[in-house]
């Protein structure tokens, strides 16, 4: 079974070594989640031809997946530490419903999907501790999430496969941008 960062022998601190700092924990968690996404993408791509599909734009219009934009202050030009951190946390909170959707979408990688979801929850907690401006962070409404989940699960098989592919791809891009930005914080 996949192991969360800090649980495997490589991460267990030797008796006299210090525990991971908050930045180290965040960095390790993001890289761990990215590894998980790679494994999930592998299964998705092996199972269907979605990874080569040219019809992505069609399905993407129906999804409102979090994306980094210039105004979020996470890119090299116009970088803003506070604004960006709020965007990263808000984006991760918005991704949670999509990660919930992924839970029943995998056969051989079922545990990996659960580990990505759980590790994302832990990552959000670490980032919230780091953020000063918590007031600016908006949490999605549970009712909105519930109806979105129902809608996604009611799609036909092709759209569900496409949705799975798009969620993984978008989440990977979001985390990679987050990782780059966090390294200037």
């Amino acid at each position: 079974a996949p192991v969360l960062p800090g649980e495997d022998s490589k991460d267990v601190a030797a008796p006299h070594s210090q525990p991971l700092t908050s930045s180290e924990r965040i960095d390790k968690h993001i890289r761990y989640i990215l590894d998980g996404i790679s494994a999930l993408r592998k299964e998705t791509c092996n199972r269907s031809n979605m990874c080569e599909s040219s019809k992505e734009a069609l399905a993407e219009n129906n999804l409102n997946l979090p994306k980094m934009a210039e105004k979020d202050g996470c890119f090299q030009s116009g970088f803003n530490e506070d604004t960006c951190l709020v965007k990263i946390i808000t984006g991760l909170l918005e991704f949670e419903v999509y990660l919930e959707y992924l839970q029943n979408r995998f056969e051989s990688s079922e545990e990996q999907a659960r580990a990505v979801q759980m590790s994302t929850k832990v990552l959000i907690q670490f980032l919230q501790k780091k953020a000063k401006n918590l007031d600016a962070i908006t949490t999605p409404e549970p009712t909105t999430n519930a109806s979105l989940l129902t809608k996604l699960q009611a799609q036909n098989q092709w759209l569900q496969d496409m949705t799975t592919h798009l969620i993984l791809r978008s989440f990977k891009e979001f985390l990679q941008s987050s990782l780059r930005a966090l390294r200037q914080m």
């Epitope: 070594s17 210090q18 991971l20 700092t21 930045s23 180290e24 960095d27 090299q76 030009s77 116009g78 970088f79 803003n80 530490e81 506070d82 000063k132 990782l179 780059r180 930005a181 390294r183 200037q184 914080m185």
Partner: antibody, heavy 120, light 111 residues
């Protein structure tokens, strides 16, 4: 063209203070974490301090903790190092350095350095 | 004494290959892929060559390459040229949000 120009170095007595400045140009200063690295005469490099892009987080080498303070003014594109309780072993060339974007712990640009001499 | 151990000097003839080692611990070199290498020509500020263990910085010739095995990193310079004569420093992230450097290695290009 990226430029980092240090100033404020000089001769100071043990126990004294100095404030180093680094004027940055040719890039969006507020987007980058910055550091100070020093080099004692004829010796190797030693990392001194780091500050995040927005100035929220700061880190220090044990050898300067409690004596040196790193800060920045993004409106003026300037990095600072306030050095108090200076010791002879602080004598070195102090370099202002920029962290590579999106890379953890690597310096892609260095200033030419400013000499600090602590002696009675 | 420096936190990372480098040989004080290495030498090689033009056109040949030299390797500079940088030994650390599991808390720095062995912790992640956070090793970088810098070249310092006499009287000049250091210049980045390699970051993240093996990625070449912009504008750096492919004669320079980096690698890592366990707690030891290495910089390899192939096709040695006279202008490569300089001091070379390795640096690594160390657990606890700090950076440590090696003591530096002076490369002499013979002949």
């Amino acid at each position: 063209e990226v430029q980092l120009v240090e100033s404020g170095g000089g001769l100071v007595q043990p126990g004294g203070s100095l404030r180093l400045s680094c004027a940055a140009s040719g890039f969006t200063f507020s987007s980058y974490a910055m550091s100070w690295v020093r080099q004692a005469p004829g010796k190797g490099l030693e990392w001194v301090s780091r500050i995040s892009s927005g100035g929220i987080s700061t880190y220090y080498a044990d050898s300067v903790k409690g004596r040196f303070t790193i800060s920045r003014d993004n409106a003026k594109n300037t990095l600072y190092l306030q050095m108090n309780s200076l010791k002879p072993e602080d004598t070195a060339v102090y370099y202002c350095v920029r962290y590579a974007w999106g890379v953890q712990w690597a310096f892609d640009f260095w200033g030419q350095g400013t000499q600090v001499t602590v002696s009675s | 004494s420096y936190d990372l151990t480098q040989p004080p000097s290495v030498s090689g003839s033009p056109g040949k290959t030299v390797t500079i080692s940088c030994a650390g611990t599991s808390s720095d070199v062995g912790y992640g892929n956070y090793v970088s290498w810098y070249q310092q020509l006499p009287g000049m500020a250091p210049k980045i060559l390699i970051y993240d263990v093996n990625k070449r910085a912009s504008g750096i010739a492919d004669r320079f390459s980096g690698s890592k095995s366990g707690n030891t990193a290495s910089l390899t310079i192939s096709g040695l040229q006279s202008e490569d004569e300089a001091d070379y420093y390795c640096a690594s992230y160390r657990r606890g949000e700090t950076i440590v450097f090696g003591g530096g290695t002076h490369l002499t290009v013979l002949g």
